[in-house]
Interface confidence: low
């Protein structure tokens, strides 16, 4: 064309893949009627018309952008839509009259690629290679034009370093005119990278400006031979009888040596290996204090073949003995005096304490509980705890039973028993004593007796209710050697003035329970008239 | 004591099936990389497939990739090679070996399992 | 890619015999050498720069120069008569493993 050279630099639309391009004819009312002019695209130099404007009224030519022109802006401005990266050329237009001037536009087409795709070498890098090895590959897909690439480790940029840093990038165009990048990163990596974090940063333009996404952050598994083995025992802190404790070896280097765990003998000072689970861990379930002593680890480096040492350990189990109490079960007369004494042993300082079994009540801080002056009501259990107070849950009790001389004690000495007739009644009767009672009815029925303790007893009698027992009443009698006691119950029928819904009743220290005898699984808990309670 | 077992080898005709199996102990089995490795009789050794010590990714020789899958289930220390569409030129003897540093080195090997494929 | 080895060699009993292995990945890599006897499997003899696997007598050595590994046994025993392979990652796909085709040596 005449006078090309001497044409300005053609004017830049910058757009992005998919949208819209307006491509605006630049010539002047005195270069060009824009109601005839014709429109070209530029390929390798070659033209091709693509769009023809007549009396204002655009017509597309047939080829590849037949269908995405028209006119806008009084026919000043040619549309193209749904750009692609091949739309990247210059477009012209060219007026005819009053003579032949054209106008130049260059449409410049941007794409963001997608989110950069980090894969790391799973199979890992050892730090003794020859040369960098593959640390992880970066993929960005579908960006236009190419994206740059910029790996990072810890953040900061990698640059290529000859031996240790080598970054292989790699491109493919897509069937959409589209650029997938590939970036590997290679490098020589040291033990200290093991928990180095590595990720990649696409570059790319928009018609906005410059911009960039960034990979997630990958680890890469480092191999390193083994320079140290220790010993780490779970749960920290002090050790106690019954914990479950977990002794592992742990090395610096990776894959982990071959580990084994070995227990100094005491008696022979020898190293004697320790039976450990699959994943070579020592675990002591429930640890006893045998368990204490001097451990350590060897573990044998595959890749050196050296075996490393770890620090021995001393492993205290702490503990406490069997109590022992003494006496061990003392039997005593009343108004005499009893001295009980708690020994036990301990890898600690132990704190004993006396308790009253039946009450929890403390009694005595100390090994040492003295009795005095011995009444029947102190009779009963007495536990002895002995604790190491600087180990929360370290202690053992031991019970013992003081049994006082004497003959049967009633838990009531007479009581009243609402019932009606016919119906089975369940009676009960509980008696205390040493030697422990025993209990028999003036009446059949089906009687059972349980021992409550040492010194306590209660039995249970299941009886029809008859008007000959509504007559005599029930009584138990509870008999020991040092003699018996007996216990009454009267039998009063209920009717419907006896019980009114405000009647102020209550029960006794037992209850019965009346049963209609002709239907067996009804019962009902008989409700008692105040009375005084009485011991015998 | 670091110990593979391999298993599962036999007569197969050409285009049939087998499923090799390897079991592993003495070793934290899901820490390494695992190899199978076959031997032609009277020929030298042959890399057939690999696998990552999660199981997550595998790699396959030339000779058997599309027809060869190697697997493994770490709950049970046990690596596998299923081989379909088998050829006369798969007779071998396969070993398991486990693979230190994920590449370097086959540090252990088991004693092998006989393939044969005829009609 | 692919490892080269020469077929077979032979060594008087108490002297000294190197085998080589040749290929472009030993530019990268170190080549790892397994000593396989009749009927038996394969073990490790030398790995990484010049490391004894675990029982292997010190006579035997590895040592790398170029695109060349060497495998030497120094005062050869009868017991080291066996088929010799060399191994390494292949440099056009680091996850893929070559071996050399190996060498027989015979102690006379």
């Known amino acids: 064309v005449p006078g090309e050279a001497e044409q300005p630099a053609p004017e830049l639309v910058e757009v992005e893949v998919g949208s819209t391009a307006l491509l605006k004819c630049g010539l002047s009312q005195s270069q060009g009627n824009l109601s005839h002019v014709d429109w070209f695209s530029v390929h390798k130099e070659k033209r091709t018309l693509i769009f023809r404007v007549r009396q204002g009224q655009g017509q597309s030519e047939p080829g590849e952008y037949e269908q995405r022109l028209s006119l806008q802006d009084r026919g000043a401005t040619l549309a193209l839509t749904q750009v692609t990266p091949q739309d990247e050329r210059i477009f012209l237009c060219q007026g005819k009259r009053p003579r032949s001037q054209e106008y130049r536009i260059q449409l410049r087409v941007y794409k963001a690629p997608e989110e950069p795709n980090i894969q790391v070498n799973p199979l890992g890098i050892p730090v003794n290679s020859k040369e960098p090895e593959e640390v992880a590959t970066c993929v960005g897909r579908n960006g236009y034009p190419i994206p740059q690439v910029i790996w990072y480790k810890n953040g900061r940029p990698l640059k290529e370093e000859k031996n240790r840093v080598h970054i292989q990038s790699s491109q493919t165009v897509e069937s959409s005119g589209l650029y997938t990048l590939q970036s590997i990163l290679k490098a020589q990596l040291v033990k200290e990278d093991k928990d180095a974090q590595f990720y990649c940063e696409l570059n790319y333009r928009l018609p906005s400006g410059n911009h960039m996404k960034e990979s997630r952050e990958v680890t890469v598994p480092v191999f390193y031979p083994t320079e140290k083995v220790w010993l780490e025992v779970e749960p920290v802190g002090m050790l106690k009888e019954g914990d479950r404790v977990e002794i592992r070896c742990l090395a610096d280097g990776n894959p982990p040596p071959h580990f084994s765990i070995s227990k100094q003998n005491p008696s022979t000072r020898e190293a004697e290996e320790e039976t450990t689970n699959d994943n070579g861990v020592l675990v002591l379930e429930p640890a006893r204090k045998e368990h204490s002593g001097r451990y350590e680890c060897q573990g044998l480096d595959l890749d050196t073949m050296i075996s490393l040492l770890s620090e021995p350990q001393e492993l205290l189990v702490n503990y406490v003995s069997d109590v022992r109490v003494s006496p061990a079960a003392p039997e005593r007369q009343e108004g005499s005096s009893l001295t009980l004494t708690c020994e036990a042993e301990s890898s600690q300082d132990l704190e004993f304490q006396w308790l009253r079994e039946e009450t929890g009540q403390v009694l005595e801080r100390g090994p040492v509980l003295q009795l005095h002056d011995l009444k029947r009501e102190a009779g009963g259990g007495y536990r002895c705890v002995a604790s190491v107070p600087s180990i929360p849950g370290l202690n053992r009790t031991q019970l013992v039973n003081v049994a006082i001389f004497g003959p049967p004690w009633m838990a009531f000495k007479e009581r009243k028993v609402w019932v009606k007739e016919n119906m089975v009644l369940n009676l009960s009767c509980e008696a205390s004593g040493h030697p422990r009672p025993t209990i028999s009815w003036n009446v059949n029925g089906t009687a059972s007796e349980q021992d409550q303790d040492p010194q306590r007893v209660l039995s249970t009698l299941n009886v029809l209710v008859t008007p000959e027992l509504l007559e005599t009443g029930v009584e138990c009698t509870a008999s020991n050697d040092l003699g018996k006691n007996t216990s009454i119950l009267f039998l009063e029928l209920v009717n419907l003035t006896t019980l009114t819904p405000d009647s102020n009743t209550t029960t006794g220290l037992s209850t019965s329970t009346a049963s209609p005898h002709t239907r067996a699984n009804s019962t009902s808990t008989e409700r008692k008239l105040p009375e005084p309670e009485s011991r015998g | 004591e670091v110990q593979l077992l391999e298993s599962g080898g036999g007569l197969v005709q050409p285009g049939g099936s087998l499923r090799l199996s390897c079991a592993a102990s003495?070793?934290?089995?899901?820490?390494?990389?695992m190899s199978w490795v076959r031997q032609a009789p009277g020929k030298g050794l042959e890399w057939v497939s690999a696998i990552s010590g999660s199981g997550g990714s595998t790699y396959y020789a030339d000779s058997v990739k599309g027809r060869f899958t190697i697997s493994r289930d770490n709950s049970k220390n046990t690596l596998y090679l299923q081989m379909n569409s088998l050829r006369a030129e798969d007779t071998a003897v396969y070993y398991c070996?486990?693979?230190?540093?994920?590449?370097?080195?086959?540090?252990?090997w088991g004693r092998g399992t006989t393939v044969t494929v005829s009609s | 890619s692919e490892l080269t080895q020469d077929p077979a060699v032979s060594v008087a009993l108490g002297q000294t015999v190197s085998i080589t292995c040749r290929g472009d990945?030993?530019?990268?890599?170190?080549p790892t050498w397994y000593q396989q006897k009749p009927g038996q499997a394969p073990i490790l003899v030398i790995y990484g720069k010049n490391k004894r696997a675990s029982g292997i007598p010190d006579r035997f050595s590895g040592s790398d120069s170029g695109n060349t590994g060497s495998l030497t046994i120094t005062g050869a025993q009868a017991e080291d008569e066996a088929a010799y392979y060399c191994?390494?990652?292949?440099?056009?796909?680091?996850?893929?493993?070559?071996f050399g085709g190996g060498t027989k040596v015979t102690v006379l």
């Open positions: 191994s390494s990652r292949d440099s056009s796909d680091n996850h893929l493993r070559l």
């Open positions: 070996a486990r693979d230190l540093y994920g590449g370097f080195v086959f540090d252990y």
């Open positions: 990945s030993l530019k990268n890599y170190y």
């Open positions: 003495g070793f934290t089995f899901s820490s390494y990389a």
